[in-house]
Amino acid sequence: MSSKYPRSVRRCLPLWALTLEAALILLFYFFTHYDASLEDQKGLVASYQVGQDLTVMAAIGLGFLTSSFRRHSWSSVAFNLFMLALGVQWAILLDGFLSQFPSGKVVITLFSIRLATMSALSVLISVDAVLGKVNLAQLVVMVLVEVTALGNLRMVISNIFNTDYHMNMMHIYVFAAYFGLSVAWCLPKPLPEGTEDKDQTATIPSLSAMLGALFLWMFWPSFNSALLRSPIERKNAVFNTYYAVAVSVVTAISGSSLAHPQGKISKTYVHSAVLAGGVAVGTSCHLIPSPWLAMVLGLVAGLISVGGAKYLPGCCNRVLGIPHSSIMGYNFSLLGLLGEIIYIVLLVLDTVGAGNGMIGFQVLLSIGELSLAIVIALMSGLLTGLLLNLKIWKAPHEAKYFDDQVFWKFPHLAVGF
């Protein structure tokens, strides 16, 4: 017989989610309006396409990337969509309140939707570490806290460090990774005997996870260039990201084979490592002057990703209770750090070359930004983890971890799907 949602959650989730949605509708009614300025249709379409790319990355890319669990693939995809939809709404309001509100109403533009989608992406990266161990009511809390924390982080960085949109959004990798890992650390860890098979991957879900990775791979250049200011910068960012992810694919597949005693390729390694180059060049994608440098970074990122996928899961599983196939957290934490370090190295090279004290000061500011991002991620992640542990949310019992049948109606009640 299929295990049902506890009665209390059946009451709690719809009430919680619909009340929140009603509150958001009211906030949009009172505080927002559309940008009424003249825009030509061609420019509008071009601007919308970038947002569309980001939505595809979020809904299909990250949605399917996290769907490799044998018994949790439906929930992974649908919960991702739910979080994206909720996260975008809250992020648009929050960004507006933080940046525009003193001047009156929040003006909604295609650019603000683009920003909001990227903010919501942060949650989808983080949630990989906890999917299967939480219910939708808990995920709503996670979305609200993480989007709020990231919005405030970006606002602080923008005001204190005078950083532009691209630079302060590129902290998303590190922020999302450490947020997710700290939430996972707070959640109950042990899987009771007999449920270990649920967090294993299966062929069809693994194929859909590969599909997600392919979508992310195709659209990563759009993500890295979305917030840049001029066509020259965007073009450079697209080229460099493309070269980096191309090399990281080759590195991932060959490195995965190299890491296996029989020379076999691991699906899990490939899922994550194909994206490695895109994450690693993210912060500096517009600054890298030539393809070979981007390719070298893609190679290094691919190797780090495969190495991490080989040696870190054991540690993550033991300490944080993250299953072996949930690799985004530690992968992005390593590669996000690599990306930030690359940017800092560029500034250090500037200081050495110019002997300019002000550039040295910029190095310190960049280190300060990175440290702030990590600290806020860890603190807000721990806060979220503690909130998610409250009895009010009726979290799934450990025996029901990674089980679609807890959340979904399957008429045929098939066990192996």
């Epitope: 030509d40 601007s47 683009r114 532009d164 200011r229 517009h286 600054l287 002057p289 002000m358």
Partner: antibody, heavy 129, light 110 residues
């Protein structure tokens, strides 16, 4: 020839609105960010607003935030500045300017530079009762 | 976003060298390389004469040069000419897509 021509200035009462236009010619308008800059009588230049090349993002000086709106129509090669709730201190010559992005490279990184390389001759706005 | 400080006026004889300073109260100039200088003849469109601290656009005479030290940028006109009589303004990127101009300096050729 690369050219920017402002229009729409005039005398207006405090609290009223005015819309300035800037017609661009001689270059691919949709590839460039655009600025409005003003100069009050006897004062220096003051940056007012910028709009990105695709119109996706806009930024304003604190002194005009919430009152002025910059926009563009790339199909008409025209930049606009909608000025609402005008005050006496908004009296100035308003210039539109093209934003040129250039870069130089070392072996390890690119350096981007932004400069207002082409300006119009300006249009005068007088706010007076 | 307070204006960058420039001397109100500078004068010199033809052939002389003059230097106009542009000082920021905050880190606007020091933190960024986006310092440019504009020449503005009354009734005409302003014209950029120095970009990126010290680069001259094509068509600008080589007697104009720019430099930067800490929080102060400088424009030097060596071999002053009568046609150099104009107002000169510096401009710096002030972070998060905003700009700040100098108070302006009137150059008089004696």
């Amino acid at each position: 020839e690369v050219q920017l021509v402002e229009s729409g200035g005039g005398v207006v009462q405090p609290g009223r609105s005015l819309r300035l236009s800037c017609a661009a010619s001689g270059f691919t308008f949709s590839n460039y960010g655009m600025h409005w800059v003003r100069q009050a009588p006897g004062k220096g230049l003051e940056w007012v607003a910028v709009i990105w090349y695709d119109g996706s993002n806009k930024y304003y000086a604190d002194s005009v935030k919430g009152r002025f709106t910059i926009s563009r129509d790339n199909s008409k090669n025209t930049l606009y500045l909608q000025m609402n709730s005008l005050r006496a201190e908004d009296t100035a010559v308003y210039y539109c300017a093209r934003e040129m992005v250039s870069y130089s490279s070392s072996w390890y990184r690119r350096y981007y530079y932004y400069v207002m390389d082409v300006w119009g001759k300006g249009t005068t706005v007088t706010v007076s009762s | 976003q307070s204006a960058l400080t420039q001397p109100a006026s500078v004068s010199g004889s033809p052939g002389q060298s003059i230097t106009i300073s542009c000082t920021a109260t905050s880190s606007d100039i020091g933190a960024y390389n986006y310092v440019s200088w504009y020449q503005h003849h009354p009734g005409k469109a302003p014209k950029v004469i120095i970009t990126d601290v010290n680069k001259r656009p094509s068509g600008v005479p080589d007697r104009f040069s720019g430099s930067k030290s800490g929080n102060t940028a400088s424009l030097t006109i060596s071999g002053l000419q009568p046609e150099d009589e104009a107002e000169y303004s510096c401009c710096s990127y002030a972070g998060t897509y905003s700009y700040v101009f100098g108070t302006g300096t009137k150059v008089t050729v004696l």
